[in-house]
Interface confidence: low
Amino acid sequence: QRFAQAQQQLPLESLGWDVAELQLNHTGPQQDPRLYWQGGPALGRSFLHGPELDKGQLRIHRDGIYMVHIQVTLAICSSTTASRHHPTTLAVGICSPASRSISLLRLSFHQGCTIASQRLTPLARGDTLCTNLTGTLLPSRNTDETFFGVQWVRP
Amino acid sequence: QRFAQAQQQLPLESLGWDVAELQLNHTGPQQDPRLYWQGGPALGRSFLHGPELDKGQLRIHRDGIYMVHIQVTLAICSSTTASRHHPTTLAVGICSPASRSISLLRLSFHQGCTIASQRLTPLARGDTLCTNLTGTLLPSRNTDETFFGVQWVRP
Amino acid sequence: QRFAQAQQQLPLESLGWDVAELQLNHTGPQQDPRLYWQGGPALGRSFLHGPELDKGQLRIHRDGIYMVHIQVTLAICSSTTASRHHPTTLAVGICSPASRSISLLRLSFHQGCTIASQRLTPLARGDTLCTNLTGTLLPSRNTDETFFGVQWVRP
């Protein structure tokens, strides 16, 4: 159904517009494939307006449809590094609450050293997004090569 | 802090919604790695609503957080063309004012012939975005293969 | 020209915000390069709010500038599958009405198995978007690997 038949006026706050852009803080310890993120003006051009970080993972504060985007660049990489013998894959998903756990976006580094994608997905308040990097290759921490963000689009 | 605690009504103009989608005009002369862009209805499906072009570079007119996106396809390219012997890299950054110069987004063509990515970033009125293509390979000018755009997202 | 000099108040409905995110249903029969899409809550995380599906193709219901995005992953693929000898290409375009037929976004799988991109483009009510995958390789139907969506951005 259409999202607003009623013609009510909208205050800015009700538009939502929650938005976050994060930079890589660090990778997880052995056996933890998650990437840990950080954000805030003191760190450069990353920020959180609405969503929050919970132990390096992004937690949503407002229900709605979001545009989720990510770019990850492998740190020590040539076109031969990421071959099918050592598949390196990035997956973005809801990791908690467990009842809503699902993979939202998945990409493999075949003969490339960077993946970048984006998608629209419904998210709910309390959803925590995790980004799992499987394989033996390490991501670059350069802020223009590796970043992760969300943008609230509509209710 | 949250961007609007006050519940004021919003006129359309104040929403900003500055937006631009550009097509490649030409590459720079020797020693100038910048791509020069063009936009406008007469050129096809490119446009500028708010931002302006300054000698082929995109200048921002409204402060805010923007979604910046780009796709560049190399013109004469096979999966072997862009090898480790000839690294071709695309970088999008603020190139003026000099005090705000920074690289926002960077990708290398490893064994691929197209890069595409997007990110959220704060931009200020007067910021000029430059797209630098380093390497010996030329970009395609096909409007469905190479394009660059920004979208105002929120204050 | 600026899109709204008048300072009129905006009801939510007039903001548009038409949005859709689709998952792959099936490929076309021999000689039909189109991908056929599906969407709706019963299918998972795909949805249509405004646009509609017409025989698996996405039809726009509201004039405006849209962000179009897509990711397609090849199903049986290694880094050598899509080689220079055998180009597999994805093109997103307006396929009807015929008078507005145009390619909006095009990418080739060179030595990669996934393409992902996005662009801003003006679309009009009644425009139908088709996604053509040329070549003999089949796309993955995993919902986190292959998806297609649009987001209304502004009038």
């Epitope: 076109s79 071959s83 | 090898s83 | 693929c77 050598t80 599958t81 220079r84 055998h86 003999t136 390789l137």
Partner: antibody
Framework: QVQLVESGGGVVQPGRSLRLSCAAS????????IHWVRQAPGKGLEWVAV????????YYADSVKGRFTISRDNSKNTLYLQMNSLRAEDTAVYYC???????????????WGQGTLVTVSS | DIVMTQSPLSLPVTPGEPASISCRSS???????????LDWYLQKPGQSPQFLIY???YRASGVPDRFSGSGSGTDFTLRISRVEAEDVGVYYC?????????FGPGTKVDIK
């Protein structure tokens, strides 16, 4: 099913020319690179030439470079080998072979024709 | 040009027994993408060659699993775990890394 059928072989005098054809069926010819491979009587295999799916690139063995020309007509699903200035050592069975790249790898000749015999003799 | 050598050039075999053929290249066939561009073909008597192994160790479609390929760089081996009568013929390795592609001289396998 995939089929490659060579034709055009025969007996020819040294210094003369001959054109071989390879008719393809059962697959999308315009998607595949195609090779010519030859085998002299009682000898091993020798790669001769390759042409890209769209004809944009062609490569040759040193032994035939400048004398042989590989070409294709995708509208006719046909591959050609124009052989000029023929020599006795060009005597061989000539096979066309499809490049297997589209089957999931980019090396290997996955389908071969039955071959056509070229005899260069005075 | 890359030169390919094979050994032995002739290999008498007993059905049911294993057999192996060696192939060497004058320079590495390990491509920048991590794959070894070395293929194996079998030419049975009176027939066109048929595809066996690609990229060093990957069996082509329809090839029985008694055939296996191994090796990297410049040294490669084709193994038949249990030879069958239908396996007789000449086995060729080929450099498919760069043009000109070059075949080895072939190894003739026949029943003792």
């Amino acid at each position: 099913q995939v089929q490659l059928v060579e034709s055009g072989g025969g007996v020819v005098q040294p210094g003369r020319s001959l054109r071989l054809s390879c008719a393809a069926s059962g697959f999308t010819f315009s998607n595949y690179g195609i090779h010519w491979v030859r085998q002299a009587p009682g000898k091993g295999l020798e790669w001769v030439a390759v042409i890209w799916y769209d004809g944009s690139n062609k490569y040759y063995a040193d032994s035939v470079k400048g004398r042989f020309t590989i070409s294709r007509d995708n509208s006719k699903n046909t591959l050609y080998l124009q052989m000029n200035s023929l020599r006795a050592e060009d005597t061989a069975v000539y096979y066309c072979a499809r490049d297997g790249g589209y089957s999931g790898y980019d090396s290997g000749f996955d389908y071969w024709g039955q071959g056509t015999l070229v005899t260069v003799s005075s | 040009d890359i030169v390919m050598t094979q050994s032995p050039l002739s290999l008498p075999v007993t059905p049911g027994e294993p057999a192996s053929i060696s192939c060497r290249s004058s320079q590495s066939l390990l491509n920048s993408n991590g794959y070894n561009y070395l293929d194996w073909y079998l030419q049975k008597p009176g027939q066109s060659p048929q595809f066996l192994i690609y990229l060093g160790s990957y069996r082509a479609s329809g090839v029985p699993d008694r055939f296996s390929g191994s090796g990297s760089g410049t040294d490669f081996t084709l193994r038949i775990s249990r030879v069958e009568a239908e396996d007789v013929g000449v086995y060729y390795c080929i450099n498919s890394l760069q043009t000109p592609f070059t075949f080895g001289p072939g190894t003739k396998v026949d029943i003792k």
